[in-house]
């Protein structure tokens, strides 16, 4: 009759688990793209925005060929945890302007948390170490100004978009190697 309702599906096929992770990543990518577009429309960005506390992009066209599943999943999880911290920070510290995007930011945070749980599950199924590599957590201080928090929001959503875009490509490529 199958597992009771609400219990996680036990899968012996890591590719099915990877498929599920790809699906969630794609869904989050679409949400991020939509929210980034909303941000640009509501608060037009002048040029590119960066934030020192954001993780550097882990993948590029040059590194796709040498990807290994343990490294990709571990790095992706660490980077997404950083983005989760940044989204939480935006919601709490971003100022009244960003409160107008509160339903969307809240939904984005929930999806991000869901994807992180899925990656954790996938790593445990593949018997990969759960411990994130040691890296200093930069405390996220108050925005210097409202304009600064809007610029930070553009940087966070832009960086998350790029990270998820490469994550989908990387995970799909790794699936073919399983």
């Amino acid at each position: 009759p199958g597992p009771p309702a609400g219990s996680p599906r036990v899968s012996s096929d890591p590719r099915a688990d990877l498929d599920s992770a790809v699906l969630l990543t794609r869904s989050l990518l679409a949400d991020t793209r939509q929210l980034a577009a909303q941000m640009r429309d509501k608060f037009p960005a002048d040029g590119d925005h960066s934030l020192d506390s954001l993780p550097t992009l882990a993948m590029s066209a040059g590194t796709l060929g040498s990807l290994q599943l343990p490294g990709v999943l571990t790095r992706l999880r660490v980077d997404l945890m950083s983005y989760l911290r940044h989204v939480q920070w935006l919601r709490r510290a971003g100022g009244p302007s960003l409160k107008t995007l509160e339903p969307e930011l809240g939904a984005l945070q929930a999806r991000l948390e869901r994807l992180l749980r899925r990656l954790q599950l996938l790593m445990s199924r593949l018997a990969l170490p759960q411990a994130a590599p040691d890296q200093p957590v930069i405390p996220l201080g108050p925005p210097a100004s409202a304009w600064g928090s809007i610029r930070a929001a553009h940087a966070i959503l832009g960086g998350l978009h790029l990270t998820l875009d490469w994550a989908v490509r990387g995970l799909l490529l790794l699936k073919t190697r399983l």
């Epitope: 709490r92 302007s97 409160k99 409202a146 304009w147």
Partner: antibody, heavy 117, light 111 residues
């Protein structure tokens, strides 16, 4: 140094209007959200309204919604509060305040508005 | 009636430590940062603590803020006569879409 100077207060009859101004200097005005906060004589602080750094987002306290309008002119480094249909309970010292996020890091000295017949 | 609840008064003698509480709900203190302001008699309020527990430059480290769940508190150690003032907590409220304040606590330094 950062300076916020309110003006436009005075005595006004119930039902009439008044416009408060807040002249800002010593910082890049167009980078900051700005608020109005008021304090009735002998009472506590009450938030009135906020306007985003470029003027597109505005929020108001329920007690002033539909009667007060917050606006700004970034070219003049000035914040405004247009107060219509004034009531006796609007009598207070009105402060403008600068905010980087949700905390008021600089306040003006305040301007007194008295609504009385 | 204020959305955030503070005791109307508090007192202490010089050198003592006093704590002022601020109670709210999940839509304000529970999900947003808490700030504290000091208002000396006849003057505009001044930022004392922001981001739950950060002090602006120039504020002595005798003042500290903390938060747990839907409550926050301001602690003042080594009380001085010049600390006699009104203290207000505040936070953004997601349900009201605005800033909410506590009713204020009048701190008296005895003796």
């Amino acid at each position: 140094q950062v300076q916020l100077v309110e003006s436009g207060g005075g005595v006004v009859q119930p039902g009439r209007s008044l416009r408060l101004s807040c002249a800002a200097s010593g910082f890049t005005f167009s980078h900051y959200d700005m608020h109005w906060v008021r304090q009735a004589p002998g009472k506590g602080l009450e938030w009135v309204a906020v306007i985003s750094y470029e003027g597109s987002v505005k929020f108001y306290a329920d007690s002033v919604k539909g009667r007060f309008t917050i606006s700004r002119d970034n070219s003049k480094n000035t914040l405004y509060l247009q107060m219509n249909s004034l009531r006796a309970e609007d009598t207070a010292v009105y402060y403008c305040a600068r905010t980087p996020g949700f905390h008021f890091d600089y306040w003006g000295q305040g301007t007194l508005v008295t609504v009385s017949s | 009636q204020s959305v955030l609840t503070q005791p109307p008064s508090a007192s202490g003698t010089p050198g003592q430590r006093v704590t002022i509480s601020c109670s709210g709900s999940s839509s304000n203190i529970g999900s947003n940062y808490v700030n504290w302001y000091q208002q000396l008699p006849g003057t505009a309020p001044k930022l004392l603590i922001y981001y739950d527990d950060l002090r602006p430059s120039g504020v002595p480290d005798r003042f500290s803020g903390s938060k747990s769940g839907t409550s926050a508190s301001l602690a003042i150690s080594g009380l001085r006569s010049e600390d006699e003032a009104d203290y207000y907590c505040s936070a953004w409220d997601d349900s009201l879409s605005g800033v909410v304040f506590g009713g204020g606590t009048k701190l008296t330094v005895l003796g």
